[in-house]
Interface confidence: medium
């Protein structure tokens, strides 16, 4: 995985370039869970979606998220998360026309209905961490990651490379 300086450098580079008009290189339908195996779930309420972090029983169906993968157009100088020297970014959509968005003002993660091209707030730099975990860094705010806080998703500032492996910003992707 990248050190934090590398993360910030590439995110800044990405911030300077627009990728919103580019088609995804691949898509992957997966359930999303925390490092501690709590499930990320989505519920429709009053015509909007709420995001939850829940303990689910074995027979309770996990919600799926469509991850669309994009390549940055900036070559990588460091090894780690790059694909052929490029950074991977993702958008996350739990249901048609809704995408996870970073609300940097409120330090929150929200689901917004929107049309393509998607805004920058819907893009996250994908980092492959240890133990088959990933983390999601805001395209719009270098060093800020999707994390778990008080049983909700929130934006969490990571200010050192050691904190990149903090459990509350690590997520697992599973096809089941």
């Amino acid at each position: 995985a990248f050190g934090i300086s590398g993360v910030q450098k590439y995110t800044r580079a990405l911030h300077d370039s627009s990728i919103t008009g580019i088609s995804p290189i691949t898509e992957y339908l997966a359930s999303l869970s925390t490092y501690n195996d709590q499930s990320i779930t989505f519920a429709l309420e009053d015509e909007s979606y709420e995001i939850y972090v829940e303990d689910l029983k074995k027979d309770e169906k996990k919600d799926k998220v469509l991850l669309s993968y994009y390549e940055s157009q900036h070559p990588s100088n460091e090894s780690g998360d790059g694909v052929d020297g490029k950074m991977l970014m993702v958008t996350l959509s739990p249901t048609k026309d809704f995408w996870l968005h970073a609300n940097n003002k409120e330090h929150s993660v929200e689901l917004h209905k929107c049309e393509k091209p998607l805004p920058d707030q819907a893009f996250f730099v994908l980092h492959n961490m240890h133990s088959n975990c990933v983390s999601f860094e805001c395209k719009t705010d270098p060093g800020v990651f999707i994390g778990v806080k008080d049983n909700h998703l929130a934006l969490i500032k990571v200010d050192s490379s050691e904190n990149l492996c903090t459990e509350n910003i690590l997520f697992k992707l599973s096809e089941t």
Epitope: T41, A43, E45, Y52, E54, D55, L56, K57, K58, D59, E60, K61
Partner: antibody, heavy 121, light 107 residues
Framework: EVQLVESGGDLVQPGRSLKLSCVTS????????MTWIRQVPGKGLEWVAS????????YYPDSVKGRFTISRDNSENTLYLQMNSLRSEDTATYYC??????????????WGQGTLVTVSS | DIQLTQSPSTLAASLGERVTISCRAS??????LIWFQQKPDGTIKRLIY???TLESGVPSRFSGSGSGTDYSLSISSLESEDFAMYYC?????????FGGGTKLELR
């Protein structure tokens, strides 16, 4: 930690009404169906009423249909059971239990401690 | 309505012994069966769901099996805290129904 705490049980006369409450915590209440189950002293368990996570649909056995009404307040994480036209055979400990998650799963992973309703003149 | 017949109604056993409780449905319930334990203070705990899935935190000496109309709960080696009432429940079809219960007592 998941908790369900029932209250409202009392001694009431036949024909009268009583309302039970179940305050919940430790899980996302509005994502789960909820159920009331009762147990006559020294006897077995009987399903009494169920309600969907939104409150949009309710289910009852014939023994209480038309007399009991299950409801919920998702903003307060609270389940209710309104019991009208009470009969002596309604004397029981009433338990609330967390039912299925809105789209899947099996019921009754968690139960309250119960509240005793005694119907007697 | 689906009837659940639980047997035996009372079971006397010794510590360390293996015991099995049976639950028979009046029609197929497709593994939609739960086993509960009720302690003397009234506390109810789910042990097994989907006929054979062990609830997290429940000791592995408990196991459930069965299909169609015939189901069973087994305890491989009885411990003192296992002496209690046991109930099965079918949740295949409304109205959901419970078995009559089995009282497991110390011989």
């Amino acid at each position: 930690e998941v908790q369900l705490v029932e209250s409202g049980g009392d001694l009431v006369q036949p024909g009268r009404s009583l309302k039970l409450s179940c305050v919940t915590s430790g899980f996302i209440f509005k994502n789960y169906w909820m159920t009331w189950i009762r147990q006559v002293p020294g006897k077995g368990l009987e399903w009494v009423a169920s309600i969907t996570n939104t409150g949009g649909a309710t289910y009852y056995p014939d023994s209480v249909k038309g007399r009991f009404t299950i409801s919920r307040d998702n903003s307060e994480n609270t389940l209710y059971l309104q019991m009208n036209s009470l009969r002596s055979e309604d004397t029981a400990t009433y338990y609330c239990a967390r039912d299925r998650r809105y789209n899947s799963g099996s019921p009754f992973a968690y139960w309250g401690q119960g509240t005793l309703v005694t119907v007697s003149s | 309505d689906i009837q659940l017949t639980q047997s035996p109604s009372t079971l006397a056993a010794s510590l360390g012994e293996r015991v099995t409780i049976s639950c028979r449905a009046s029609q197929s319930i497709s593994n939609s069966l739960i086993w509960f334990q009720q302690k003397p203070d009234g506390t109810i705990k789910r042990l097994i769901y989907s006929s054979s899935t062990l609830e997290s935190g429940v000791p592995s000496r408990f196991s459930g099996s069965g299909s169609g109309t015939d189901y069973s709960l087994s305890i491989s080696s009885l411990e003192s805290e296992d002496f209690a009432m046991y109930y099965c429940l079918q949740y295949a079809t409304y109205p959901w129904t419970f078995g009559g219960g089995t009282k497991l007592e110390l011989r």
